[in-house]
């Protein structure tokens, strides 16, 4: 056979589906690799071919589209399982070809089992909700295309193992789960189970996501520098170690980059000819507010270093702040025999 453009194994698309549930998998060629869609390819006389390699096997084999009740079928650029079985796990390849053109890509499909409380090895998407913010909704994900709009499915929402059915602050509303107001106690895994009929059979789609309640933009403030501050003076003798912590609080802000940095005499530490090290640690509150600490360290400080300006800077989407540390050279304690005696007029 003639050469085929092989895009290899697309591990970016690690597709996980639940056992005994319908799954529709689009050929990734048209989504990520080719500049045209399936309709264009089809009308140009190209054919889409599917095959697979079972888990722990090397042999590529055709997909059996003649199973009872059309358990596996293909529709346009979609491979359908109605439903999946555990041993459908493997690497699937879709190939687009005619006599003069060929392009193919493979992707891994993992069929996973869940327990009665929806626990499974499935990687869960995380949905962040703002704390005490007002109405926010999450929508049952990845259910488009499974049934026509004329079919009205039933949707049941669970938090963890428990069906949500009381009128508390979290209310199921069809495909949506409405958080009238979100609290820390609403952190957890939420599952929607969509049940729909098809050709006399009943299918279930299970979708679980993790809700994380985070700081509200209503409460967000510019970075706050807790240290250095006006109450602490860093007094050192030459030869001692100088340690200055810069501790900054950042409100949670969606997609904001939090930055902390030191300047010495207005320059980045790397641009100053002194032996300085900076160590950073980061901690988070329950609502993902962030505290960053950068400790500036000079092992053996010189009298020259003690005259420099040390400024901690911080920046977030809310603004930029800076604070200088008060650094002084320690005045040596007087030696009694000479200095004090002189002070008392002794000769």
């Amino acid at each position: 056979s003639e050469r085929c453009d092989d895009w290899g194994l697309d591990t970016m698309r690690q597709i996980q589906v639940f056992e005994d549930e319908p799954a529709r998998i689009k050929c990734p060629l048209f989504e990520h690799f080719l500049k045209f869609n399936y309709s264009t390819a089809h009308s140009a006389g190209l054919t889409l071919i599917w095959y697979w390699t079972r888990q722990d096997r090397d042999l590529e084999e055709p997909i059996n589209f003649r199973l009872p009740e059309n358990r596996i079928s293909k529709e346009k650029d979609v491979l359908w399982f109605r439903p999946t079985l555990l041993n459908d796990t493997g690497n699937y390849t879709c190939m687009l070809r005619n006599t003069t053109y060929c392009s193919k890509v493979a992707f891994p499909l993992e069929v996973v089992q869940k327990d009665s409380c929806f626990n499974s090895p499935m990687k869960l998407p995380v949905h962040k909700l703002y704390i005490e913010y007002g109405i926010q909704r999450i929508t049952c994900p990845n259910v488009d295309g499974y049934f026509p709009s004329s079919v009205k499915p039933t949707i049941t929402w669970y938090m963890g193992c428990y069906k949500i059915q009381n009128f508390n602050n979290v209310i199921p509303e069809g495909m949506n789960l409405s958080f009238l107001i979100a609290f820390i106690s609403n952190n957890g895994n939420y599952t929607c189970v969509v049940t729909y009929p098809e050709n006399g059979r009943t299918f279930h789609l299970t979708r679980t996501l993790t809700v994380k309640v985070v700081g509200s933009p209503k409460n967000a403030v510019p970075p706050v520098i807790h240290s250095p501050n006006d109450h602490v003076v860093y007094e050192k003798e030459p030869g001692e170690e100088l340690l200055i912590p810069c501790t900054v609080y950042f409100s949670f802000l969606m997609d904001s980059r939090n930055e902390v940095w030191w300047t010495i005499d207005g320059k980045k530490p790397d641009d100053i000819p002194i032996d300085v090290t900076i160590n950073e640690s980061i901690s988070h509150s329950r609502t993902e507010d962030e505290t960053r600490t950068q400790i500036l360290s000079i092992k053996k400080v010189t009298s020259e270093d003690l005259k420099r300006s040390y400024v901690c800077h911080a920046r977030s989407a809310k603004g930029e702040v800076a604070k200088a540390a008060t650094v002084k050279q320690k005045v040596p304690a007087p030696r009694y025999t000479v200095e004090l005696a002189c002070g008392f007029g002794a000769t």
Partner: antibody, heavy 118, light 112 residues
Framework: QVQLVQSGAEVKKPGASVKVSCKAS????????MHWVRQAPGQGLEWMGI????????SYAQKFQGRVTMTRDTSTSTVYMELSSLRSEDTAVYYC???????????WGQGTLVTVSS | QSVLTQPPSVSAAPGQKVTISCSGS????????VSWYQQLPGTAPKLLIY???KRPSGIPDRFSGSKSGTSATLGITGLQTEDEADYYC????????????FGGGTKLTVLG
């Protein structure tokens, strides 16, 4: 099509109870909540409470707490609203209405006039 | 006394534009979605707007909704005689317990 058909008008004496029914059809009964809203003659709309037909859980307006009971019968796709210790100011048209909490009340029954008079 | 405040009445001529306001607080309109209902004389209310500005199917685009801060507005353009009705805004409040709240209603009169 969605239909909510309510029981007929009632005349009650003060202190009595009334039970209004609302039969739903044209949709999956357990997929939507049912609200009860009343309207006194020449007045505005007043929310009384809500029932989840799926599990039967309810939430009542503070004003009616202890006097109102909402129930459902999934076998007949019917919800009921019972109001006890009736007083003359309970004279109103009582509506059952299908909907969610955050996205509006999309279908309303035709209303049931309850008259409380001695 | 309603939690949501609406003007008791508004009027305009056919073909004109009219707006109906609905004023609340941060505990209701400020944090939540607003719905609007039309009640023609002698009939049950009908949903016009939900989620502040969305129209159910079958509602003409002459009807629009908006929200700013703790107030909401219903707009009606190209006024028609059949628009003469009572209009109600609605939202909810949650303070450990759910409570659906309606405005007091606004009577729209189409002049002429």
């Amino acid at each position: 099509q969605v239909q909510l058909v309510q029981s007929g008008a009632e005349v009650k004496k003060p202190g009595a109870s009334v039970k209004v029914s609302c039969k739903a059809s044209g949709y999956t009964f357990t997929s939507y909540y049912m609200h009860w809203v009343r309207q006194a003659p020449g007045q505005g709309l007043e929310w009384m409470g809500i029932i989840n037909p799926s599990g039967g859980s309810t939430s009542y307006a503070q004003k009616f707490q202890g006097r109102v009971t909402m129930t459902r019968d999934t076998s007949t796709s019917t919800v009921y609203m019972e109001l006890s210790s009736l007083r003359s100011e309970d004279t109103a048209v009582y509506y059952c209405a299908r909907g969610f909490v955050t996205s509006g009340i999309d279908y309303w029954g035709q209303g049931t006039l309850v008259t409380v008079s001695s | 006394q309603s939690v949501l405040t609406q003007p008791p009445s508004v009027s305009a001529a056919p073909g004109q534009k009219v707006t109906i306001s609905c004023s609340g607080s941060s505990s209701n309109i400020g944090n939540n979605y607003v719905s609007w209902y039309q009640q023609l004389p002698g009939t049950a209310p009908k949903l016009l707007i939900y989620d502040n500005n969305k129209r159910p199917s079958g509602i003409p685009d002459r009807f629009s909704g908006s929200k700013s801060g703790t107030s909401a507005t219903l707009g009606i353009t190209g006024l028609q005689t059949e628009d003469e009705a009572d209009y109600y805004c609605q939202t909810w409040t949650y303070t450990g317990r759910l409570w659906i709240v309606f405005g007091g209603g606004t009577k729209l009169t189409v002049l002429g």
